[in-house]
């Protein structure tokens, strides 16, 4: 019997054991977070699966993920949202220490999908473990990209108070309008709920003492945010290692000077 023809995409295929991984992560998350103990992980998986299974993987829409978003609805207290762009690891290290602040990946849906890839095939109930669409080479409306766009939009929409964003000062574009932060989250912060956006620009080099808050791309971010009637603040984090250390031990004498 000849194998059925399968669409070849440019990106890597679905992460192995994807259903088991999502289900296991969901169970673990709901065990650790008492406010999410009511979540039925089988229902969450069913809704996740329903978003992409049997659908052409270059024609996925935000609508497809709304049932999953509905089941994973979670609120972050005001002043506790941390966005990030091109500096995921440090952002996650920070929220692991500062437990009352939350990145998207600290929320159920972000936690479920973090670092995973998935896609299905049109008109079959199969998951494609061989290849999935690449955002650049194949299409932007693929299951993974649309998922992150959908949950990022929702995360930004529900933020309130002072919102923080961690930006990578080592990149040529510290603020990139094409990043998820620049293209989705910035535009979905609600001015009636968000008083201010505070950017933390993380320096890379040890001897880098420049004020990266004066960078043209940061000025561009300030302009976008100000036009949306949200105040903007910026801080340089010259020593990220010391910054994390001081979050862990704020009483340390060396933490009284600048970081």
């Amino acid at each position: 019997v000849l194998p059925r023809w399968r669409q070849q995409w440019s990106g890597s295929g679905t992460t192995s054991r994807f259903p088991e991984t999502v289900l296991a992560r969901c169970v673990k998350y709901t065990e650790v977070h008492p406010e999410m103990r009511h979540v039925d992980c089988q229902s969450v998986w069913d809704a996740f699966k329903g978003a992409f299974i049997s659908k052409y993987p270059c024609n996925i829409t935000e609508e497809d993920y709304q049932p999953l978003v509905k089941l994973g609805t979670q609120t972050v207290p005001c002043n506790k949202t941390l966005l990030w762009s091109r500096i995921k690891d440090l952002a996650h290290q920070f929220t692991q220490v500062q437990r009352d602040m939350f990145t998207l990946e600290d929320m159920l849906l972000g936690y479920l999908a973090d670092d995973l890839t998935w896609c299905g095939e049109f008109n079959t109930f199969e998951i494609n473990y061989q290849s999935c669409p690449d955002w650049r080479k194949d299409c932007s409306n693929n299951p993974v990209s649309v998922f992150w766009k959908t949950v990022s939009r929702r995360f930004a929409e529900t933020a309130c108070g002072v919102v923080h964003v961690m930006l990578n000062g080592s990149r040529s574009k510290i603020f990139d309008k094409n990043s998820t932060f620049g293209s989705v989250e910035v535009h979905n912060l609600q001015p009636e709920k968000v008083q201010a956006l505070e950017a933390w620009v993380i320096h890379g080099g040890r001897e880098d003492s420049r004020d990266l808050c004066q960078d043209p791309t940061i000025k561009e971010l300030e302009s976008i945010i100000s036009k949306r009637n949200i105040r903007f603040f910026c801080k340089n984090i010259y020593r990220p290692d010391k910054f994390l250390q001081c979050v862990k031990n704020p009483e340390d004498s060396s933490c009284l000077s600048g970081i």
Partner: antibody
Framework: EVQLLESGGDLVQPGGSLRLSCGAS????????MSWVRQAPGKGLEWVAD????????WYADSVKGRFTISRDNSENTLYLQMNSLRAEDTAVYYC????????????WGHGTTVTVSS | QSVLTQAPSASGTPGQRVTISCSGS??????VSWYQQLPGTAPKLLIY???ERPSGVPDRFSASKSGTSASLAISGLQSEDEADYYC??????????FGGGTKLTVL
């Protein structure tokens, strides 16, 4: 044939209670989200409540939150709406509806059951 | 007050094409469905997932969605199309919401 059949509608006094039932047949009831939708006399459709396929999640319109409870018995293929603290403004025809793939639309509707709240 | 806005009435003569519109911010990121309610009967699904027709619905009924508005078009209008038409979607809280309904009169 795919069918939904509501029952339990009645005339009840303000502050009273009523339990509506909706029997399902012709489809795998336990695979689908279900909704209750109502229509006051001469008015439009108003969504009342939703329940997930396994019954573990429920959602309510603000107008009924805390007073109405949606539930289901998948072994009996039956959807319920327990209505407490009834008010005159709850007077309506109540429909149960099957949700097609969560949010595609409500593809099967019952014929409706009439609830009248009046003293 | 519905977050989906529909004109209260529309009319057309037999054979004509009529369009019923529905607008609301939640339409942007949620599927829209359309329902026909003939006098004294339960609603019937006409369109699901923005523009798809369930089997049995004549192809005279079509729909589209763009941004925060959606529309239902009925071509070759017939007397039996006289009914109330409702759009529905999920709102920003991801709960169902219906438009106020449009009463279609066939002149």
């Amino acid at each position: 044939e795919v069918q939904l059949l509501e029952s339990g509608g009645d005339l009840v006094q303000p502050g009273g209670s009523l339990r509506l039932s909706c029997g399902a047949s012709g489809f795998t009831f336990s695979d689908h989200y279900m909704s209750w939708v109502r229509q006051a006399p001469g008015k439009g459709l108003e969504w009342v409540a939703d329940i997930s396929a396994r019954g573990s999640n429920t959602w309510y319109a603000d107008s009924v939150k805390g007073r109405f409870t949606i539930s289901r018995d998948n072994s009996e293929n039956t959807l319920y709406l327990q209505m407490n603290s009834l008010r005159a403004e709850d007077t309506a025809v109540y429909y149960c509806a099957k949700n097609w793939n969560y949010n595609y639309g409500m593809d099967v509707w019952g014929h409706g059951t009439t609830v009248t709240v009046s003293s | 007050q519905s977050v989906l806005t529909q004109a209260p009435s529309a009319s057309g003569t037999p054979g004509q094409r009529v369009t019923i519109s529905c607008s609301g911010s939640s339409i942007q990121n949620n599927y829209v469905s359309w329902y026909q309610q003939l006098p004294g009967t339960a609603p019937k699904l006409l369109i699901y997932r923005n523009f798809e027709r369930p089997s049995g619905v004549p192809d005279r009924f079509s729909a589209s969605k763009s941004g925060t508005s959606a529309s239902l078009a009925i071509s070759g209008l017939q007397s039996e199309d006289e009914a109330d038409y409702y759009c529905a979607s999920w709102d920003d809280s991801l709960n169902w919401v219906f438009g106020g309904g449009t009463k279609l009169t066939v002149l």
